[in-house]
């Protein structure tokens, strides 16, 4: 069975979060997709969305967020550049499918941004999470105002969460520090 999980990314100020959300190609290729933040006890807030219909491999930039929808592969790529401490929070990808409620994608991203020197590009402390180049063409898309009450949930308390760290043989400090936390089965 598919598990809805959280993946924790611990990054420094100035670095880039670079993640992907996969979706069912046949159902959602041209659907409008969005990147949302979920604050405890609040409705999910849409921060950026693709165009409607979503265009293939066409970067959409809203502030420091860049979305790129690879239709042919059923992948939405999300980049948040020049991260700030206040960007910390729980994020998710959703697919808009009016008049139905938005369809939530796996996995949720728990972003923790801390202050500190993020290194210089090219150093071994860095990863693609630091690397960013502005796409050649970007478009700001208008996002629907509604969000789904169904997606308002809180992460399980840390004491009861089944936390499994990445495989010990991988040095994930050079990739990004990720912890996978199942939310429900």
């Amino acid at each position: 069975a598919t598990k809805l999980t959280e993946e924790k990314y611990e990054l420094k100020e100035g670095q880039t979060l670079d993640v992907k959300c996969d979706y069912t190609l046949e159902k959602f290729a041209s659907s409008q997709k969005a990147w949302q933040i979920i604050r405890d006890g609040e409705m999910p807030k849409t921060l950026a969305c693709t165009e409607r219909p979503s265009k293939n491999s066409h970067p959409v930039q809203v502030g420091r967020i860049i979305l790129e929808d690879y239709h042919d592969h059923g992948l939405l790529r999300v980049r948040m550049v020049n991260l700030q401490v206040e960007d910390s929070g729980l994020y998710q990808c959703v697919i808009y499918q009016p008049p139905k409620e938005p369809h939530m994608l796996f996995d949720r991203i728990r972003l923790v941004v801390t202050k500190g020197f993020s290194g210089t590009p090219g150093s071994n402390e860095n990863s693609t999470q630091n690397v960013y180049k502005i796409p050649p063409t970007t478009t700001k898309a208008l996002c629907p105002l509604y969000t789904s009450p169904r997606t308002v949930t809180q992460a399980p308390p840390k004491s009861t969460a089944d936390v499994s760290t990445p495989d010990s043989e991988i040095n994930l400090t050079n990739v990004t520090d990720i912890i996978r936390v199942p939310v429900f089965n």
Epitope: T24, L25, D72, G74, D107, I109, P121, T128
Partner: antibody, heavy 123, light 107 residues
């Protein structure tokens, strides 16, 4: 340790299908995407596509889209790649590969490789 | 699709030599580039990821550099076990593509 063990060599006739299996062990199968890469004899590497074992979603490059199906059985931690309408140019070694980072990371670094499965298409 | 061009396609060198292989992308791929080593009859092995990061357990004689369109892979002092074929691979966008490979042979 992480291991990807693939099924044995296959000989197929043109027009037939082949299904290659890839059994994963040493890690949580549903946490990492499985990709498929092929290599024709004496040739370079060619990426075919990916599958997220948790969601079951997959994607493949245009040239394979109508012929390839990527599936998984989470109960046995096994990924499958089926290629149909085989032609002689599909003769190659097929590799299943696990990425370096979790499924949500946009990081396509192929860290763990299966031993490869030779598929020969000949009439 | 982004084309990756490796040069040279083959190269002869001796143990102890410094060897350099280049990889050129058809457009800017930032640092989204990996390097692999493949020995005959074996699966490829990840050596360098994100242009310059050494994969865990890979000897420090291997290194990578570059960003944008031009990348370099270097073996500082060639060892007998390093004779193999080397591939670059980008992942700046989808689809992912590999270079055609560089075969490193004993002189």
């Amino acid at each position: 340790q992480v291991q990807l063990v693939q099924s044995g060599a296959e000989v197929k006739k043109p027009g037939a299908s082949v299904k290659v299996s890839c059994k994963a062990s040493g890690y949580t199968f549903t946490s990492y995407d499985i990709n498929w890469v092929r290599q024709a004899t004496g040739q370079g590497l060619e990426w075919m596509g990916w599958m997220n074992p948790n969601s079951g979603n997959s994607g493949s490059v245009k040239k394979f889209r109508d012929r390839v199906t990527m599936t998984r059985d989470t109960s046995t931690s096994t990924a499958y790649m089926e290629l149909s309408s085989l032609r002689s140019e599909d003769t190659a070694v097929y590799y299943c590969v696990r990425l370096i980072g979790y499924s949500s990371a946009y990081k396509w670094s192929f860290q763990h490789w299966g031993q490869g499965t030779l598929v020969t298409v000949s009439s | 699709d982004i084309q990756m061009t490796q040069s040279p396609s083959s190269l002869s060198a001796s143990v102890g030599d410094r060897v350099t292989i280049t990889c050129q992308a058809s457009r800017d791929i930032s640092k989204y580039l990996n390097w692999y080593q493949q020995k005959p009859g074996k699966a490829p092995k990840l050596l360098i990821y994100d242009a310059s990061n050494l994969e865990t357990g890979v000897p420090s004689r291997f290194s990578g550099s570059g960003s944008g369109t031009d990348f370099t892979f270097t073996i500082s002092s060639l060892q007998p076990e390093d004779f193999a074929t080397y591939y670059c691979q980008h992942y700046d966008n989808i689809p992912i593509t590999f270079g055609q490979g560089t075969r490193l042979e004993i002189k």
